[in-house]
Interface confidence: medium
Amino acid sequence: LRRCLISTDMHHIEESFQEIKRAIQAKDTFPNVTILSTLETLQIIKPLDVCCVTKNLLAFYVDRVFKDHQEPNPKILRKISSIANSFLYMQKTLRQCQEQRQCHCRQEATNATRVIHDNYDQLEVHAAAIKSLGELDVFLAWINKNHEVMFSA
């Protein structure tokens, strides 16, 4: 069970995001649209599904958001790269959970992830990436909130 713990320094990720979030959110041209911030999507996740949703959202950011976003500012790009590397490390940790069959994906978890991907698909790719980056604090807060639940299950 110990190997399931996300040992990444969440505070470091949050600090990196805090330093860039206004610059990212300033480029968001769809204020009344949301991808993750419909927190209901994440709030209704049961403890059993937390590992799966975390795994899926990490994949969402690593495979879609970070790849789709084109950042011209090298200082901001460095911070985003740092967050991306932390997410890759977290993915590696969660793969160990999967190998121990502790990260089963039930229907509710799959549905929650699908909603987020659908929201993303409704926007033009660069606008969607900007908005998802701007909503990183929602995901980070959710991880923090569910961290204990996730690994005591």
């Epitope: 600090e15 805090q18 330093e19 860039i20 979030k21 206004r22 610059a23 300033a26 480029k27 041209t29 769809f30 204020p31 009344n32 911030s37 500012n73 200082k75 901001i76 911070k79 604090d137």
Partner: antibody, heavy 120, light 111 residues
Amino acid sequence: QQLEESGGGLVQPEGSLTLTCTASGFSFSSSYWICWVRQAPGKGLEWLACIDTGVSGDTYYANWAEGRFTISKTSSTTVTLQMTSLTAADTATYFCARDIFGSAIDNSLWGPGTLVTVSS
Amino acid sequence: AIDMTQTPASVSEPVGGTVTIKCQASQSISSYLAWYQQKPGQPPKLLIYSASTLASGVPSRFRGSGSGREFTLTISDLECADAATYYCQCHYHGSSYWDNSFGGGTEVVVK
């Protein structure tokens, strides 16, 4: 968490002045929009400029303020507004504010203001 | 620059009444609009952001609506403490500019 403006006072026409916005209880190391807004006596609010205190350092100005006003982050707790070629029309209370347009995460925060009087 | 036109300039209503303040932008600003309350000698206080989202600690008697060019602030069940000047403010940004223009303000007198 508080903001406080300083540096106001009496200045001659065509003179210059630098106002300072000082944060306490939080740091400008994180990314916030820190903006300057002014209010002439008995008049409405007028936006001057904003700066992203994070790594981007992006600055934005009202069209009419560009060139005469300069917003800068000078330390992890201070943001300044440099004003040049001042006229009587610049007489106002100058406010600094954090995230003036609101956010689900951070509350909007304003200083009490500092009065600038341009007169000979 | 975006012009924000606020109406009326002044309104007087009794305690318990309802006040409606309108704000019109010179171009579409989506829902990038905030409402502020200011009392004499005090800095402005944010009431509503993103056109309709209540800021923290603001009572639900305050309601914002609208998008595009037309916006409304409605204050219901008026209290004496609501006597103040109210401002709308756009915070619209393009790729290389921002506009944070304020409306001219509406003075609310509570009788």
